[in-house]
């Protein structure tokens, strides 16, 4: 044997190298791959170093047992059978509330007779719940709504007003409140006629009415 | 009627391991994920982590990750906890909670645990 | 992780007075969960999904809310309502509960 060289690299098994016939002069390169469904366990990457030695001890391709890690899907949290994803394991995807599954909740890694393992599908996605909206209420009687849409999304508010001479009776908004079914904060309210009892009842005044034959008071009802 | 018998208060010495078990009954146990909480002497509630009966799945608050360990067993319908490299900071009450579709929705009695030198 | 902030810490009521408490969240969430503890026992689930009642929970009691603002109120107040209670969401995980409202009777 050459004494100016660095020893013959052998072949692998389940992987192979290159360049196939090296050059085994100092700075040469030499790179170890496996065959799919093997990984490379120790340095792939082996240099003819002055010493005439390679730089690293000779590889070896090792069977893959286990899955590459999903990841996490956005929204939600999961829950994993093993930690390292042997073949068998299972991943399951819970989305969070509020969030729909979009895809498999469950991930098992299978084996493959050739290749690595791999599991049964994608990883799924968490999408935001569509919320429907609330029906458009009627206006009051002798009164108005705004806005006049038919449906308003959830979180929206629409606002009630009345007529001259009509006194709201209730919430004068309310609001879509997101939920499954949405649904409105509290009833429509209503347009009552503004009566000189309430106005005056409303201010705990005491009014002396005037004789029955000349009273505008009561002419005002 | 939906049971969860937890095991009795412990006294632990700091950098010990202790494991705590709740016993599910009155119901398919494979069917409802348990879940552990924490409740410290402050009386906040903190979730650890939950685990599925049935596939052994396991998922862990990123804060309990190294502390608790979660495990089951379906022949006896029992959930297990195992937290490890105790310090004061582990004196609480720890509940196991049957999962109730994004709350809990039973509780066990809690078991007490005490770690002082 | 999303914070819960209840409001107030702690509170005391008269029998049949009305009663609100308020849980506040650090970011917008789908539904608040509520749960009752009393002195030496476990929580338990006392409103779900914002606004559900759990089982045996008297129709006084009830819930609402949406976005980051959520609510429990007790139309009036007896004295077995006395105790702790604690808003809880999953909207994000890790679930998160409140720091708690003690309520106390008059």
């Known amino acids: 044997p050459r004494n100016d060289t660095c020893p013959e690299l052998p072949e692998i098994p389940n992987g192979w190298k290159s360049p196939s016939q090296p050059e085994l002069v100092h700075g040469t390169v030499v790179t170890y791959q496996c065959y799919p469904g093997y990984q490379v366990v120790g340095s792939s990457v082996l240099m003819c170093q002055w010493d005439l030695t390679w730089s690293e001890d000779l590889p070896s391709c090792q069977r893959v047992t286990s899955c590459h890690d999903p990841g996490d899907v956005e929204h939600s949290r999961r829950l994993i059978s093993s930690p390292k994803f042997p073949v068998g394991a299972t991943v399951q995807y819970i989305c969070d509330q509020g969030f729909v599954l979009m895809g498999s909740s469950i991930l098992t890694c299978h084996d493959r007779q050739a290749g690595s393992p791999k599991w049964s599908d994608r990883a799924p996605k968490c999408l935001l719940e569509q919320l429907k909206p609330c029906h458009g209420l009627s206006a009051p009687e002798n009164g108005a709504r705004s806005p006049e849409k038919q449906l308003h999304p959830a979180g929206a508010t629409i606002h009630f007003s009345c007529a001259p001479g009509y006194v709201l009776k209730g919430q004068a908004s309310i609001k879509c409140v997101p939920g499954h079914p949405s649904h409105w904060s509290d009833p429509p309210p209503i347009c009552r006629a503004a009566s000189l009892d309430g106005f005056y009842n409303s201010r705990s005044l005491d009014v002396a009415k005037a004789p029955a034959a000349s009273s505008t008071l009561d002419a005002a009802h | 009627e939906v049971q969860l018998q937890q095991s009795g208060p412990e006294l632990m010495k700091p950098g010990a391991s202790v494991k705590m078990s709740c016993k599910a009954s009155?119901?398919?146990?494979?069917?409802?994920?348990m879940h552990w909480v924490k409740q410290n002497q402050g009386k906040s509630l903190e979730w650890i982590g939950e685990v599925n009966p049935n596939t052994g799945g396991i998922g862990y608050n990123q804060k309990f990750k190294g502390k608790a360990t979660l495990t089951v067993d379906k022949s006896s319908s029992t959930a297990y906890m195992d937290l490890r490299s105790l310090t004061s900071e582990d004196s609480a009450v720890y509940y196991c909670?049957?999962?109730?579709?994004?709350?809990?929705?039973?509780w066990g009695q809690g078991t007490t645990l005490t770690v002082s030198s | 992780q999303i914070v819960l902030t209840q409001s107030p810490a702690i509170m005391s009521a008269s029998p049949g007075e009305k009663v609100t408490m308020t849980c506040s969240a650090s970011s917008s969430i789908s539904y608040m969960h509520w749960y009752q503890q009393k002195s030496g026992t476990s929580p338990k689930r006392w409103i779900y999904d914002t606004s559900k009642l759990a089982s045996g929970v008297p129709a006084r009691f009830s819930g609402s809310g949406s976005g980051t603002s959520y609510s429990l109120t007790i139309s009036n107040m007896e004295a077995e309502d006395a105790a702790t209670y604690y808003c809880q969401q999953w909207s994000s995980t890790p679930p998160t509960f409140g720091g708690g409202t003690k309520l106390e009777i008059k």
């Open positions: 909670a049957r999962d109730g579709n994004y709350c809990f929705d039973y």
């Open positions: 009155g119901y398919i146990f494979t069917d409802y994920n």
